[in-house]
């Protein structure tokens, strides 16, 4: 009996520009002989319902229809028919199908590949056109994919050390699509510094599918009004 197993859950998520390995493992009751084996990988895009060949290997023929695509013949011997795609792009997301022949049997499996791009976040202070004691803090998130993103603002005071979400005076603009298919968005927080306690820590919190943990950028209100900090580093998909 010949069986093919793909990524558990049927979905693989990979970061933009990564060298991704799309898993496909062959299970067979006998030792595998590469001379009687073949592997073809197909791809179907999210937008266009047509399957195209990505890579094929059989007999004395091997071809990468997508530049750089490779299945290791040595790993194939041990049942690993995984496809390696260097420098994966957003438009390469979709359904990948691994079709395996171990003479005279045939088996196949499919997996959805999601390509994500993590946002970069930075805080800016905009005082142009603002009244005295009034500041506008901008949290810019850029280069993310997919479009869905959640930006919130939180504050911590010495009285209330647990973060409190700020809902007033927050305006989040529309997402803007970049030439490369990624998105940008800016969220603004308007603050009246005369009404806030010095030492209050404000955070812009960005949540996105590409992030294991939210991306947090903070600033502290001082007597001198403000002090912007570096964006805290977070673990992204690797």
């Amino acid at each position: 009996d010949l069986k093919v197993e793909m990524m558990a859950g049927g979905t693989q998520i990979t970061p933009l520009n990564d060298n991704v390995t799309i898993f496909c493992n062959i299970f067979y009751s006998q030792p595998l002989n590469i001379t009687s084996m073949g592997i073809t990988w197909f791809w179907k895009s999210l937008t266009f319902d047509k399957e195209v060949k990505v890579f094929e290997f059989f007999g004395d023929h091997q071809e990468a229809f997508r530049p750089g695509a490779i299945v290791s013949p040595w790993r194939l011997k041990s049942g690993d028919a995984s496809l390696r795609l260097p420098g994966i792009q957003l438009e390469e997301a979709g359904e990948y199908r691994c079709e395996v022949v171990v003479t005279p049997l045939k088996a196949q499996g499919t997996v959805q590949l999601e390509v994500v791009a993590s946002p970069a976040s930075r805080l800016l202070l905009d005082q142009v056109g603002m009244k005295e004691n009034e500041d506008k803090y901008m949290c810019e998130s850029s280069g993310f994919y997919p479009e869905a993103i959640n930006i919130t603002w939180e504050k911590q005071t010495q009285k209330f050390p647990h973060p409190i979400e700020i809902s007033e005076d927050v305006i989040t603009g529309p997402t803007i699509k970049n030439m490369d298919g990624t998105f940008n968005v800016t969220s603004c927080l308007k603050l009246n510094s005369s009404q806030e306690d010095p030492g209050t820590v404000y955070q812009c919190v960005v949540r996105h599918a590409s992030l294991h943990t939210p991306l947090r950028s903070n600033f502290t209100l001082t007597a001198a009004r403000h002090s912007l900090s570096e964006t805290e580093k977070t673990d992204n998909f690797s």
Partner: antibody, heavy 117, light 107 residues
Framework: QVHLQESGPGLVKPSETLSLTCTVS????????WSWIRQPAGKGLEWIGH???????NYNPSLKSRVIMSVDTSKNQFSLNLSSVTAADTAVYYC???????????WGQGTLVTVSS | DIQMTQSPSSVSASVGDRVTITCRAS??????LAWYQQKPGKAPKLLIY???SLQRGVPSRFSGSGSGTDFTLTISNLQPEDFATYYC?????????FGQGTKVEIK
């Protein structure tokens, strides 16, 4: 649905070059290998060669010294040039798409090329 | 080159019959074999690929089997439109080679 159409002169003089073009519609030429196959009248099929890009091709060793294949992705066409033809090259010439596992899953209707002075 | 030998070279049969055509490779070709049907004045049509997989749109009365060197194309319940010449083709190595053909004629 993919459609293949061969075109070229039906009559070629001995020692000259046979030139055929296959125009592909309904599919991208850059997604497949493409073959040329010929069939002399009342005989079997002979594989001439296949091409993916101009650098990636395979020719039948029996014809290799006389064959040049090329691809024009902008026109979605591929071509066959067979030089120094003789009467033995008289045949119906087919272009075909190489589908899964080396099979030819789409064919042109074929064009008869006669080599005669 | 791998030689592909088909037998018989021709077969006479009636509508409803079961017809078997064999194809033998001069060396092992694993499962890398295709079968085609050709009618007079027409281009060949793919029936079976990778020895036993039925091409989309091909009636299920056509079936293929075999691996290594010996392969079979079976037409069960022969229909009037099945009278044609059938070719096998190996895709294991270059150059690709075809069998000499088997003509299925009306008895």
């Amino acid at each position: 649905q993919v459609h293949l159409q061969e075109s070229g002169p039906g009559l070629v003089k001995p020692s000259e070059t046979l030139s055929l073009t296959c125009t592909v519609s309904g599919d991208s030429i850059s997604s497949y290998y493409w073959s040329w196959i010929r069939q002399p009248a009342g005989k079997g099929l002979e594989w001439i060669g296949h091409i993916y890009t101009s650098e990636k091709n395979n020719y039948n060793p029996s014809l290799k010294s006389r064959v040049i294949m090329s691809v024009d992705t902008s026109k979605n066409q591929f071509s066959l040039n067979l030089s120094s033809v003789t009467a033995a090259d008289t045949a119906v010439y087919y272009c075909a798409r190489v589908g899964n596992w080396g099979s030819h899953d789409a064919w042109g209707q074929g064009t008869l090329v006669t080599v005669s002075s | 080159d791998i030689q592909m030998t088909q037998s018989p070279s021709s077969v006479s049969a009636s509508v409803g019959d079961r017809v078997t055509i064999t194809c033998r490779a001069s060396q092992g070709i694993s499962s890398w074999l295709a079968w085609y049907q050709q009618k007079p004045g027409k281009a060949p049509k793919l029936l079976i690929y990778v020895a036993s997989s039925l091409q989309r749109g091909v009636p299920s009365r056509f079936s293929g089997s075999g691996s290594g060197t010996d392969f079979t194309l079976t037409i069960s319940n022969l229909q009037p439109e099945d009278f044609a010449t059938y070719y096998c083709q190996q895709a294991n190595s270059f150059p690709r080679t075809f069998g000499q053909g088997t003509k299925v004629e009306i008895k």
